[in-house]
């Protein structure tokens, strides 16, 4: 899924207050909901009909430093028998993530979002004929 | 998949600087990579062999203020037949993202990281038997 | 010793509802989906709903679609089953039953049942 | 949805005899039936699932065969506890169902 453009307004203050210095806002340190768990069912990459690797690329300078891809293992999906079915496919589920850029020039410590395109998982779907016109 | 706690030491500046005011940062304005586009094949949700609808929940003061949710459609998996198959499951695939939230008191704004667990689509997956030890 | 318990039948009217509770010991409960499968005075078995571990799926028999709703609660290990607009063939023993997949998810087949609950629709 | 019926619907046998009970379903469920057993003012007790493997604590006495649409449940020596209703079920296609029932007797 799209993350829409960020509007304008969003880094304003109300109209009745005084303008904000351009470019910078005041980020707070701590995280909201930093203890939830994900309540994914287990090995669910390895059993599914279209089963799926993970790679994590990691990097000091983001929050969070690890983020994982995934990569569907095969073009079809795999049947009851363990074979590979190729009049289906596995496709890859896309969901575009924030992330937080540390950027520092010297002493100066800024930060930044960043959209990062995940791919979460693989899932099996028919394929269409498409008609030429 | 899951994002790890944020280390104490990402938002602090190298050690011969002088130390930051405690609890909040400079936060740029601008998104990185904005216009990077999701690159999923069309309406898989639905050609899917566990398909999903999707919820949209909106709150303006997020960012992204839209975030969509997936659910699957049916406990087992479409066949080939178009009939549900409950051999398999349909089972969600979830993921761990950022969303930032705006806080204001009067004229005070500030920002803060929120993780939010977003399901983004579902699989197929067989299940299997917990044997009892 | 794993053991489920069911209880909330008992004599309703027509159109009335009933609550069933299911308290499971003995296994870790949010481990497992669940089940309630019904069975009518001399007659066979008849599968009314099941949920998965987290609530995140749920099931219903087209039988019971619209009028029944099947919730957990894995803090206090208990299955419970909330029957709205009840009907005279709705008169059964109901069983609740543990589902034998790993993960939480469905498989199905049952290998842990209580010892049922009476419910007896009738004016 | 799936019908199972279930053969015969009384079987009449002595303790140490072999017992064969037939499920047939409507269409084909692959390997995806289990069968249970039920006595009178019990719960029942799940006995074989996909087909052939026995539950936990099942005796080997107890066995399952069949694949697609026709399947057997198979009490090689019965035993005195063993008579009882049996009930076959699918796990292939949305609902499951269960067939109705098999009643074993002391001939």
């Known amino acids: 899924r799209k993350i829409p453009k960020v509007g304008h307004t969003f880094f304003q203050k109300p109209e009745s207050c005084p303008p904000v210095p351009e470019g910078s806002m005041k980020l707070d340190t701590g995280i909201i909901n930093e203890n939830q768990r994900v309540s994914m069912s287990r090995n669910i990459e390895s059993r599914s009909t279209s089963p799926w690797n993970y790679t994590v690329t990691w990097d000091p300078n983001r929050y969070p430093s690890e983020v994982v891809q995934a990569q569907c293992k095969h073009l079809g999906c795999i049947n009851a028998q363990g074979k590979e079915d190729i009049s289906m496919n596995s496709v890859p589920i896309q969901q575009e993530t924030l992330v937080l850029r540390r950027k520092h020039q010297g002493c100066s410590v800024s930060f930044q979002l960043e959209k990062v395109l995940v791919t979460v998982g693989c899932t099996c779907v028919t394929p269409v004929v498409h008609h030429v016109q | 998949r899951k994002i790890p706690k944020v280390g104490h030491t990402f938002f602090q500046k190298p050690e011969s600087c002088p130390p930051v005011p405690e609890g909040s940062m400079k936060l740029d304005t601008g998104i990185i990579n904005e216009n990077q586009r999701v690159s999923m094949s069309r309406n898989i949700e639905s050609r899917s062999t566990s398909p999903w609808n999707y919820t949209v929940t909106w709150d303006p003061n997020r960012y992204p203020s839209e975030v969509v949710q997936a659910q699957c459609k049916h406990l087992g998996c479409i066949n080939a037949q178009g009939k549900e198959d409950i051999s398999m499951n349909s089972v969600p695939i979830q993921q761990e993202t950022l969303v930032l939230r705006r806080k204001h008191q009067g004229c005070s704004v500030s920002f803060q990281l929120e993780k939010v667990l977003v399901t983004v689509g579902c699989t197929c997956v067989t299940p299997v038997v917990h044997h009892v030890q | 010793e794993v053991q489920l318990v069911e209880s909330g039948g008992g004599l309703v009217q027509p159109g009335r509802s009933l609550r069933l509770s299911c308290a499971a010991s003995?296994?870790?409960?949010?481990?497992?989906?669940m089940h309630w499968v019904r069975q009518a005075p001399g007659k066979g078995l008849e599968w009314v709903s099941g949920i998965n571990w987290n609530s995140g799926s749920i099931g219903y028999a087209d039988s019971v679609k619209g009028r029944f709703t099947i919730s957990r609660d894995n803090a206090k290990n208990s299955l419970y089953l909330q029957m709205n607009s009840l009907r005279a063939e709705d008169t059964a023993l109901y069983y609740c039953?543990?589902?034998?997949?790993?993960?939480?998810?469905?498989?199905?087949?049952?290998?842990?049942w209580g010892q049922g609950t009476t419910v007896t629709v009738s004016s | 949805e799936i019908v199972l019926t279930q053969s015969p619907a009384t079987l009449s046998l002595s303790p140490g005899e072999r017992a064969t009970l037939s499920c047939r379903a409507s269409q084909s469920v692959s390997s995806y039936l289990a069968w249970y057993q039920q006595k009178p003012g019990q719960a029942p007790r799940l006995l074989i699932y996909d087909a052939s493997n026995r539950a936990t604590g099942i005796p080997a006495r107890f066995s399952g065969s069949g694949s697609g649409t026709d399947f057997t449940l198979t009490i090689s020596s019965l035993e005195p506890e063993d008579f009882a209703v049996y009930y076959c079920?699918?796990?292939?296609?949305?609902?499951?169902?269960f067939g109705q029932g098999t009643k074993l007797e002391i001939k």
């Open positions: 039953a543990k589902d034998i997949a790993a993960a939480g998810e469905f498989y199905f087949d049952m290998d842990v």
């Open positions: 079920q699918q796990r292939s296609n949305w609902p499951p169902t």
């Open positions: 003995g296994f870790t409960f949010d481990d497992f989906a």
